[in-house]
C-alpha cells in the first residue's frame, strides 16, 4: 500500500546471491560479484513497479514529476508520477516529458526549430509564476532521434556522455544537450550545491577530467561566496 511505502525508509528487496557477474564494458569500476543482475540490464526495469514517495520533482526520475496521485488528493501524500506527453495538460515544466515544456497549461515541443524564439518569454514566465520553474528544463533534456547529427563530435546533440567521443561529455546547451570538452586542469568549472542546483544552468560545463576535482581557486578563498571562482585542480 502507499502508506507502507511512505512510512518506510528501510532498504528492501535486496537481490539474492548469484555467482560472479561480468563487469560493465568500458567501466573502470568492478561489477558486483554475488549480486543478481535482473535481465542482465544495468538500469532499472519497471516490472513490479512501486511508486516512490517524494516532496519535490528533483527526488524523482528524469521522466517523472512529484505530485499527488489523485486529482484533488491529499497534498501531503505525493509520489513520483510519469511525465506528461505532448499536448497533455500541465502546470509546470517538470510535468512534461523530455523534449517538451509547459506553455499555457499544455505540454509543447521544445525542439530547436520553433523553441528558440520562446526562450526569453519562457524565462520571464518562469520567474513570475510559482507553478512554472526552470527546474523542469534541468532534467527534461532527452531529444527525439530526428534531432541527432554526427554522433559523438563536439557540438553533437546527445542524451548522455557515452554518446560523445573520448574527452567529451554530454552537457546542457539551452534546453538540449550537446557534446562539450571535459574540463582540463586550471579550467573554470561549476560547483553546485547538490539539491535543485541545475535550475538556471542553461549553458552547462562538463565535469573535470580524470584525477581532477572542482575546487575553489586558492587566491579566491577570501572572496565573497557569490564570486568564488572554481577551477579543476589535482586531487
Amino acid at each position: 500500500t502507499l502508506n507502507s511505502v511512505l512510512n518506510s525508509n528501510a532498504i528492501k528487496n535486496l537481490p539474492p546471491p548469484l555467482g560472479g557477474a561480468a563487469g560493465h564494458p568500458g567501466s573502470a569500476v568492478s561489477a558486483a560479484p554475488g549480486i543478481l543482475y535482473p535481465g542482465g540490464n544495468k538500469y532499472q526495469t519497471i516490472d513490479n513497479y512501486q511508486p516512490y514517495p517524494c516532496a519535490e520533482d528533483e527526488e524523482c526520475g528524469t521522466d517523472e514529476y512529484c505530485a499527488s496521485p489523485t486529482r484533488g488528493g491529499d497534498a501531503g501524500v505525493q509520489i513520483c508520477l510519469a511525465c506528461r506527453k505532448r499536448r497533455k495538460r500541465c502546470m509546470r515544466h517538470a510535468m512534461c516529458c523530455p523534449g517538451n515544456y509547459c506553455k499555457n497549461g499544455i505540454c509543447v515541443s521544445s525542439d530547436q526549430n520553433h523553441f528558440r524564439g520562446e526562450i526569453e518569454e519562457t524565462i520571464t514566465e518562469s520567474f513570475g509564476n510559482d507553478h512554472s520553474t526552470l527546474d523542469g528544463y534541468s532534467r527534461r533534456t532527452t531529444l527525439s532521434s530526428k534531432m541527432y547529427h554526427t554522433k559523438g563530435q563536439e557540438g553533437s546533440v546527445c542524451l548522455r556522455s557515452s554518446d560523445c567521443a573520448s574527452g567529451l561529455c554530454c552537457a546542457r546547451h539551452f534546453w538540449s544537450k550537446i557534446c562539450k570538452p571535459v574540463l582540463k586542469e586550471g579550467q573554470v568549472c561549476t560547483k553546485h550545491r547538490r539539491k535543485g542546483s541545475h535550475g538556471l544552468e542553461i549553458f552547462q560545463r562538463c565535469y573535470c577530467g580524470e584525477g581532477l576535482s572542482c575546487r575553489i581557486q586558492k587566491d579566491h578563498h577570501q572572496a565573497s561566496n557569490s564570486s568564488r571562482l572554481h577551477t579543476c585542480q589535482r586531487h
Partner: nanobody
Amino acid sequence: EVQLVESGGGLVQPGGSLRLSCAASGFNFDDYAMGWFRQAPGKERELVAAISWSLSRTHYADSVKGRFTISADNSKNTAYLQMNSLKPEDTAVYYCAAAPRPKRVSVSYFSTASNYDWGQGTLVTVSS
C-alpha cells in the same frame, strides 16, 4: 568513465567508530545516487545505505539504522559512511557504489544492485 575509490577501513574494537570515504570522479556527481554495500566472508553483498541525487533522501538497511549515517560532499565529489557503535557482525568489505538517476525511480531502485557501478572495496574489521 565512473571511478570510485574507497578509504577509511581498518580494525576497530566493538562499540568503536569509523568513517569511510569514497572519492568519485569521471561523472556528474549531482546526477548520481551514492550507496555503500558490504560483503562479509561467505555471505551475499548487501546494500547498507544510499543517498539520492537530490541529497534530500537517505535509505538504510534495518541492521544499521541509528548507527550508520551516509552523507555526500559535492564540493569534494565524495560520499561518506559514518559508522558508530560498531559490532563484530559489521565486519565486511565495504564497497562504494554509484547509480545514475533513472528515467523512473521506484522504492526498490536504491536496493537494486544492478543499478550501480562499484569501487574496489575497503576492509572493516570489528574485533576485540
